[in-house]
Each structure stands twice: as structure tokens, then as C-alpha cells.
């Protein structure tokens, strides 16, 4: 988790003085709890936003915007802590909006802005925005929260972000899976434009079943650049097992911007489908 | 134009099953979360449903969880929702709704719905 660029982040607007800092995620009203506290934010939104940096490459962040209730609780508000939570690793980055001056009613409902958080794709957060200074102990919360799921690299608006192109995401192999005679299976995929090595990795499975009956790994060397953006094709031995009949073919990719965790395209082919006829019934029932 | 058209609504008995559907025109809609929200008479808006841009996450109300069902088809612009063992206090008007944001939140909508359908009435009584 980190803040888009360093460059000077503002919060202030007209009738407001406000400067963001960076914050522990542990504000000092939690240590010394105060008389009177702030309502909660209203109308928690978040969107995915994208922004480039100042060298050009462009992120998904997540836009957060909040209101404030029109109640007299924000001549208390001091201001009010933004915490963003990556749900898989438990990592928190936090700042806090300072107010310089204090907060009036006026004709407009107050709403805030912040579009500096960095996320990462197919990751799911917990967007959280605290009013500050945060309640006493006992005192009615005064936060709002929502889980973020980020779209992962195949969403199209995602497909052309710096992390998602640099995990391969604009490749597009168009996989193809054929089943030939003798136990064999004739996989073809589009090269890349890039000299790196590929894995082919099949797993086969029963007909209803998740557990595999077979798995076979196969390396492509680095195709030279007249081969690339060509069909490449392989024949693929499959084990002579009755009913081990679905086959499930990954193409892993070793591009140089991703090295071993490039993302992976997959093509599964299923078993064929089984007549309806019964089994023939013998004329004769064999007495041994 | 962004459109959302319902249908699939009608009078059903108590225990039966009724599928909606929702087609959906003028955005990309493979980006998007969508929704259902139903209201019920004289009641205020519910939540009911919501399904990622690609199905990968789902998430219901309490209320229909176990008996309700959401789903897409990208390629047709299409979303979903299987009703099955429908009760009298699922009697309302469903509408279909767009996620204003990319991104889903669970629980219902990260911003706001920006457009909706018309509504299709779901009655559901003996």
C-alpha cells in the first residue's frame, strides 16, 4: 500500500484551512479521549479511479469521497482519518486530514475528496474514514467503513495499467486445445513480442471430479523475434488412464517485467459426452 | 443512451419460483457491478442482490440469501436474478441497477446507483 506520487496533497476548500499528513493510524484521541466528539462521516463513497505519475505510468487508486451531517457536532471536528486495509496481508496505510480552521455551516453540505491511495489489482480493501477526534470508549462510533474489491487484470480499464501491463496483462494468447488420436492433445497459442521462455502445464482430471489424475509440465524455449507474435504448437502425450478424460492447459509466461508471477491464461477441454444407448446385455451368462 | 429494461415479473403463488431479467444497452457493460433493489409497497428502497463485473464476487440480502439467485451474461448484456420459493413479503417492484463506480463493494453500492430500470412487479400470493 502506498500514496500515489509525494507531491503536495491538498484538502483545503473554500472556508476550510486543511493540510494531510501522514498518520500512524493511531491518533492521539484514542490515548486522551475527549468530552465531546464529532457525528460520523455520511455517505461513504468509493470509485476506482486512475492517475498517472509524474513519470507517466498510470495506477488505479481509490477515489473516497464523504460528507459531513449537518448537525452542530462539526464545530467539534478536527478533521478526520482516512485508513485503507488490504484484507489478504493485514497492511494499513493511514493519513489524516488537520483542520487549521474551524468548520462553519454554510449554504452547501460539506463533502471531502481523497484519490491518493494506490491499489492493487484484484485486491479487495476496507476503506475507512474517522472523524476526529475519535469517540471515548463507551461513545456511539463515529467512523464509516466499506469493503473495495478492485477489478482484476482481464477488466478492460485495468488491462492498461502499469502493474496489470507489467504482469503481461496485453498479451493475448488465444489459446486453442485439440484432442488428436493416441492419447494426445495439440495445444497452440500466439507468442509474445519478447524473447523469454514459456511453461506449458497440463492437468487432467476424472469426469465429475477435482482431484487430478494426471499432470505433465512441458518447456517452450525463448522463441526468436521472428517468431514472435507466430503460432506456436505442441503435442502433448497424454497418460492412457479410462475416465481421466478433462484436461485443463495453463500457459505460463517468464516475461522479463514479471519474471515467474506473470499472469497465466488457461483453456480447459472437457470430456466427451457419453452415449445414451444402455450397455448391450451378453446373449449368454458365462457360468465361470 | 444508458437503458435498463426489466422483465420477467407476474403474480406468483407462495413457494413457486419466478426469474427476472434485465437487459441492458448503451454502456460497457462487462466494466460494471450491477444490482437489484426491490420496493415493496409503501416501504422505502431494499437492497436485494449484487454481482461483480465478472461474477467473481456475489452478495445478498439476509432476507433472500439461500432463496435467490444472481447472475450475468456479458456477452448478452444481461443480468439475472432465479427467485425461487418466493413468500408473500417478497411482493415488490425489482428493479435493475447500475453501479456508478468500477469496482464493487460488498453489501451494496460503493457510490451511488447511477441509472435504473423502470421496474418489473413481482406479486406473491395464494
Known amino acids: 500500500l502506498r500514496l500515489l506520487d509525494h507531491r503536495a496533497l491538498v484538502c483545503s476548500q473554500p472556508g476550510l484551512n486543511c493540510t494531510v499528513k501522514n498518520s500512524t493510524c493511531l491518533d492521539d484521541s484514542w490515548i486522551h479521549p475527549r468530552n465531546l466528539t464529532p457525528s460520523s462521516p455520511k455517505d461513504l463513497q468509493i470509485q476506482l479511479h486512475f492517475a498517472h505519475t509524474q513519470q507517466g505510468d498510470l495506477f488505479p487508486v481509490a477515489h473516497i469521497e464523504w460528507t459531513l451531517q449537518t448537525d452542530a457536532s462539526i464545530l467539534y471536528l478536527e478533521g478526520a482519518e482516512l485508513s485503507v486495509l488490504q484484507l489478504n496481508t493485514n497492511e494499513r496505510l493511514c493519513v489524516r486530514f488537520e483542520f487549521l480552521s474551524k468548520l462553519r455551516h454554510h449554504h452547501r453540505r460539506w463533502r471531502f475528496t481523497f484519490s491518493h491511495f494506490v491499489v492493487d489489482p484484484d485486491q479487495e480493501y476496507e476503506v475507512t474514514v474517522h472523524h476526529l477526534p475519535k469517540p471515548i470508549p463507551d461513545g456511539d462510533p463515529n467512523h464509516q467503513s466499506k469493503n473495495f474489491l478492485v477489478p482484476d487484470c482481464e477488466h478492460a480499464r485495468m488491462k492498461v495499467t502499469t502493474p496489470c501491463m507489467s504482469s503481461g496483462s496485453l498479451w493475448d494468447p488465444n489459446i486453442t486445445v485439440e484432442t488428436l488420436e493416441a492419447h494426445q492433445l495439440r495445444v497452440s497459442f500466439t507468442l509474445w513480442n519478447e524473447s523469454t521462455h514459456y511453461q506449458i502445464l497440463l492437468t487432467s482430471f476424472p469426469h465429475m471430479e477435482n482431484h487430478s489424475c494426471f499432470e505433465h509440465m512441458h518447456h517452450i524455449p525463448a522463441p526468436r523475434p521472428e517468431e514472435f507474435h507466430q503460432r506456436s504448437n505442441v503435442t502433448l502425450t497424454l497418460r492412457n488412464l479410462k475416465g481421466c478424460c478433462r484436461h485443463q492447459v495453463q500457459i505460463q509466461p517468464f516475461f522479463s517485467s514479471c519474471l515467474n508471477d506473470c499472469l497465466r491464461h488457461s483453456a480447459t477441454v472437457s470430456c466427451p459426452e457419453m452415449p445414451d444407448t444402455p450397455e448391450p446385455i451378453p446373449d449368454y451368462m458365462p457360468l465361470w | 443512451e444508458v437503458q435498463l429494461v426489466e422483465s420477467g415479473g407476474g403474480l406468483v403463488q407462495p413457494g413457486r419460483s419466478l426469474r427476472l431479467s434485465c437487459a441492458a444497452s448503451?454502456?460497457?457493460?462487462?466494466?460494471?457491478?450491477m444490482h437489484w433493489v426491490r420496493q415493496a409497497p409503501g416501504k422505502g428502497l431494499e437492497w436485494v442482490s449484487g454481482?461483480?463485473?465478472?461474477?467473481?464476487?456475489?452478495d445478498y440480502a439476509d432476507s433472500v440469501k439461500g432463496r435467490f439467485t444472481i447472475s450475468r451474461d456479458n456477452a448478452k448484456n444481461s443480468l439475472y436474478l432465479q427467485m425461487n420459493s418466493l413468500r408473500a413479503e417478497d411482493t415488490a417492484l425489482y428493479y435493475c441497477?447500475?453501479?456508478?463506480?468500477?469496482?464493487?463493494?460488498?453489501?451494496?453500492?460503493?457510490?451511488?446507483?447511477?441509472?435504473w430500470g423502470q421496474g418489473t412487479l413481482v406479486t406473491v400470493s395464494s
Open positions: 454481482i461483480s463485473w465478472n461474477s467473481g464476487r456475489i
Open positions: 441497477a447500475k453501479d456508478m463506480g468500477l469496482g464493487y463493494c460488498s453489501g451494496g453500492s460503493c457510490s451511488h446507483f447511477d441509472h
Open positions: 448503451g454502456f460497457p457493460f462487462d466494466d460494471y457491478a
